[in-house]
Interface confidence: low
Amino acid sequence: GITIPRNPGCPNSEDKNFPRTVMVNLNIHNRNTNTNPKRSSDYYNRSTSPWNLHRNEDPERYPSVIWEAKCRHLGCINADGNVDYHMNSVPIQQEILVLRREPPHCPNSFRLEKILVSVGCTCVTPIVHHVA
Amino acid sequence: GITIPRNPGCPNSEDKNFPRTVMVNLNIHNRNTNTNPKRSSDYYNRSTSPWNLHRNEDPERYPSVIWEAKCRHLGCINADGNVDYHMNSVPIQQEILVLRREPPHCPNSFRLEKILVSVGCTCVTPIVHHVA
């Protein structure tokens, strides 16, 4: 990998070993402006594999609100507007990082956690394995 | 919101004001096992709105590697395997949290950052604006 010289102005690290604790500034630098997934696009309604967005709230997690996509149909919407079960609507999942309060209920102490969230749905052709 | 009593065993907070600095344990609790998006499913190839996955690497960011989806076609794949331009392949985007080294090149000091990533693609009916 790339070796980058350490900045001499870095804060001291209390613990150089893993599991390591680091300082994180929660004043988020947001490169985006829109946070409501329903406002950001109407793809969830216009897709051939449409989905609903469900609000998942957990006060022990940062961010406390995450939106989860649930595909509306087993199949996909065809040109006639009907559900075609020859195709499958499937969730597109992504691993994201969240902060989990640890110990619980502490405002200033967290552990990084990876969780799997469904972001939206896509329409796929099913695979059939022909067993000899 | 829900008011949760503070745990008396919490570490002391140096700064109670925003922008606030918190302690984060980087020993990730991973609820999932598969991190390579190409292994987790082959939806990117089987979708009617297929996409390619591009590796985005940034040593100043945690996680340093993020996979970005780029839709292969403007249109969607129809039942005959051809691209149908009456439909559109569009990226499904999600805001995710990452840690950005701040000051730069510091191993133990970060700022939370929100970035927008494309996770996959879905096929949508285009919106046609009829101009009077």
Partner: antibody, heavy 125, light 107 residues
Framework: EVQLVESGGGLVQPGGSLRLSCAAS????????MAWVRQAPGKGLEWVAT????????YYRDSVKGRFTISRDNAKNSLYLQMNSLRAEDTAVYYC??????????????????WGQGTLVTVSS | DIQLTQSPSSLSASVGDRVTITCRAD??????MHWYQQKPGKAPKLLIY???NSEIGVPDRFSGSGSGTDFRLTISSLQPEDFATYYC?????????FGQGTKVEIK
């Protein structure tokens, strides 16, 4: 080997309720859509309901909509059918059915390769 | 709802006979047509899926064909254990529907 074992059938009066269970083993239960299919005495097969692997989506035949609820507990590898406001025409053997293991439409398998032995529901006064 | 009509409703045949059962849908079900065998007091058994694919362990005397709205199940040489009721199933559109069944009896 895939095994499906239904239970919970019996005699119930019209307007009554019954909850059927199906214990599944031998396959990754939470991955697959599951279904209930019924067969009235001396009659043909009739699909009743389907539930997705995650439990997020359910599908019913019109005659049972609003009366029957299909659900699942993936931690217990169990499928359920809660039947309320039962009618004489609901009298049937109820089968729990699961999809084939070789079909990789991912979370959905759209036909039934494995069936339980069935449980008889009799609605009569 | 998609209606499936099987014909004949019943048939009498002898061991060794070639038997064909047809299933007609009132609208296209593409390739999502499947065939089951059921014996008295038993659960149905999958024979053929997706029109023409034989389920594992099913004897090769059973075959399926057809497309769109017209489908056929053929038993090339009827065996004593084949006397049963046969059903077609479409899973193209909810509600999933079965044909009314074809009873194959010994002549």
């Amino acid at each position: 080997e895939v095994q499906l074992v239904e239970s919970g059938g019996g005699l119930v009066q019209p307007g009554g309720s019954l909850r059927l269970s199906c214990a599944a083993s031998g396959f990754p239960f939470s991955t697959y859509a599951m279904a209930w299919v019924r067969q009235a005495p001396g009659k043909g097969l009739e699909w009743v309901a389907t539930i997705r692997g995650s439990g997020e989506s359910t599908y019913y035949r019109d005659s049972v909509k609003g009366r029957f609820t299909i659900s699942r507990d993936n931690a217990k590898n169990s499928l359920y059918l809660q039947m309320n406001s039962l009618r004489a025409e609901d009298t049937a053997v109820y089968y729990c059915a699961s999809p084939p293991q070789y079909y990789e439409g991912s979370i959905d398998r759209l036909w039934f390769a494995h069936w339980g032995q069935g449980t008889l529901v009799t609605v009569s006064s | 709802d998609i209606q499936l009509t099987q014909s004949p409703s019943s048939l009498s045949a002898s061991v060794g006979d070639r038997v064909t059962i047809t299933c007609r849908a009132d609208e296209s079900v593409r390739t999502l047509m499947h065939w089951y065998q059921q014996k008295p007091g038993k659960a149905p058994k999958l024979l053929i899926y997706l029109v023409s694919n034989s389920e594992i362990g099913v004897p090769d005397r059973f075959s399926g064909s057809g497309s769109g709205t017209d489908f056929r199940l053929t038993i090339s040489s009827l065996q004593p254990e084949d006397f049963a009721t046969y059903y077609c199933l479409q899973t193209y559109s909810y509600p999933f529907t079965f044909g009314q069944g074809t009873k194959v009896e010994i002549k």
